[in-house]
Amino acid sequence: VTGSRVYPANEVTLLDSRSVQGELGWIASPLEGGWEEVSIMDEKNTPIRTYQVCNVMEPSQNNWLRTDWITREGAQRVYIEIKFTLRDCNSLPGVMGTCKETFNLYYYESDNDKERFIRENQFVKIDTIAADESFTQVDIGDRIMKLNTEIRDVGPLSKKGFYLAFQDVGACIALVSVRVFYKKCPLTVRNLAQFPDTITGADTSSLVEVRGSCVNNSEEKDVPKMYCGADGEWLVPIGNCLCNAGHEERSGECQACKIGYYKALSTDATCAKCPPHSYSVWEGATSCTCDRGFFRADNDAASMPCTRPPSAPLNLISNVNETSVNLEWSSPQNTGGRQDISYNVVCKKCGAGDPSKCRPCGSGVHYTPQQNGLKTTKVSITDLLAHTNYTFEIWAVNGVSKYNPNPDQSVSVTVTTNQAAPSSIALVQAKEVTRYSVALAWLEPDRPNGVILEYEVKYYEKDQNERSYRIVRTAARNTDIKGLNPLTSYVFHVRARTAAGYGDFSEPLEVTTNTVPSRIIGDGANST
């Protein structure tokens, strides 16, 4: 029965006398008067079985002690660690000349585990063991025992097992512990390849080449190899494995990506958080699923956010010129998170009496620069029929628009060809003038020629002579122009817009801002 003692991971113990409970029962020759098994107490007051001999008075001592058979377990080289205490011959009275301070270590290889006698001539000498000059002080009970540790190695071994023997030649000695072990390179994982327990080679300089196997959920990148050195250390790792898609390296293992993370390829990268607007509900995701209403285009990388179709374009303006229409619009408020936005134009020709009866315009209509895939926010449509109602739809599209089952990304305008733009505004008045502002008001055009959508006020400093002007748009028939300079002459023009386009600007209204805080009320067309 052996108790557990902790040794380095690269050592495999074949015999440990300290772990044996009860008598060791090794064979001594002679049976009496030579080596004797003695129990002593260690520092924890636990008995240790030791062998001692102290035949220091008689010359020519030849006392042998042999271990039980020791299996070699496939090891080709074994190590023998002997802890012993040796008494100074000087401390023993009257023994000069007969007392020695060394002993000899032997081994004998055998396939027979039950050899009963010691045949000295079968044994091969390993070494003569002497106490080092430096002893280790070890508490044994209340005493300080001088413990010496010596390690020797033997190899190559070839038989199933072997015996060790200790020859005393007249020393006063106690073998406190005998441990026999071999060295292995312990099971390890390097570069995601597992290398098995590997017994070291026969020579102290030999290297054993070992091929590793990729850990679970990984694959070879380059063939993983390492070398097991004679001291039980792994050397020179070559090659490696990579975690499969959906897995990342954690603590030397390939573990599944956590929920909310993914990994698309077999690389040495870690799992990445799902891109915006996507999720994973299982561990080990190789890609993330787009949120409802979000999509991933065919050529989008798994690392890209999920995106959605754009919202409708804004501020669609039409300008009809006989049988041509110019359309202009603003980019959608929401591009869906994509840069590949473009615009498609749909033209429908509608009946005058019933606008719901519309049909495609056909191939006779021409679009500049093009009808579909527009990158700009304007288009010119020509070759329309005169005096006809047309509905134009501007569709904003991007790389994922085709996946959207409920498209609502268009804005439309209905125009009638040849419809006149509004007439100019006849009367513009400055209702209130201060140092920094002018309040304007005006009448609707005499001929609106349709629904007035908005008014545009253009103004500039008189001496700039229209080189630098500003525009203000409003749906009302009045506006406050603010942020003006005091004592400065400004010129104002106003024009109206219908669905058909802008009318002409009004005649200029010249107004000079005040120098004093008091307000000046004017109602003429040219207040100064």
Partner: antibody
């Protein structure tokens, strides 16, 4: 088994001599030193000295030089204690004891049964 | 020469009790200190050597400790056959015994 056999009691007159034998058996006589110990009636143990059975070299304790002699006959595995010019205060039990040297320490591990020497006129 | 002083001179204990005997040296004797037991009319018997090692055949109720100048012999549970005189001894240049401690029945 290992044993030391001593002779029976001796009664001597003052001034006489006595030779107490100690015969060893069960082990190699010359491999262990032999020690001599005196115990006066009702008293404690008193170490007299020892003899190296291999070389025959004796060592005497203080107070046991001159009249006390340790000797050997290795051919019969016997150690001897000879006391000359006996005095009344030499009356005691005399023990031979085998000396055991060990790496852990020393001790007298095997004792003879003792020989009572009585010195009386 | 080194003087060994044992205490107490007499120790009265009942069977089953613990007995602790002391031996003090006038100067350090390292750990080379044996203990002996002597019963009336018998030769002494080696109980402990090297301050704490028991020879074969000595019951494990006998234990000893100490080094330098202070040593102790302990009988964990005194048996009827343990009533005797106990001596310590030192192995200096000259070997000497303590005067002995008598363990008697209480």
């Amino acid at each position: 088994q290992v044993q030391l056999l001593q002779s029976g009691a001796e009664v001597k007159k003052p001034g006489a001599s006595v030779k107490v034998p100690c015969k060893a058996s069960g082990y190699t006589f010359t491999s262990r030193a032999m020690s001599w110990v005196r115990q006066a009636p009702g008293q404690g143990l008193e170490w007299m000295g020892w003899i190296n059975t291999n070389t025959g070299n004796p060592t005497y304790a203080q107070g046991f030089t001159g009249r006390f002699v340790f000797s050997l006959d290795t051919s019969v595995s016997t150690a001897y204690l000879q006391i000359s010019s006996l005095k009344a205060e030499d009356t005691a039990v005399y023990y031979c004891a085998r000396v055991r040297f060990t790496v852990y320490g020393d001790g007298m591990d095997v004792w003879g049964q003792g020989t009572l020497v009585t010195v009386s006129s | 020469e080194i003087v060994l002083t044992q205490s107490p001179a007499t120790l009265s204990v009942s069977p089953g009790e613990r007995a602790t005997l002391s031996c003090r040296a006038s100067q350090s004797v390292s750990s080379n200190l044996p203990w002996y037991q002597q019963k009336p009319g018998q030769a002494p018997r080696l109980l402990i050597y090297g301050a704490s090692t028991r020879p074969t055949g000595i019951p494990d109720r006998f234990s000893a400790s100490g080094s330098g100048t202070d040593f102790t012999l302990t009988i964990s549970r005194v048996e009827p056959e343990d009533f005797a005189v106990y001596y310590c001894q030192q192995y200096g240049p000259s070997w000497t015994f303590g005067q002995g401690t008598k363990v008697e029945i209480k």
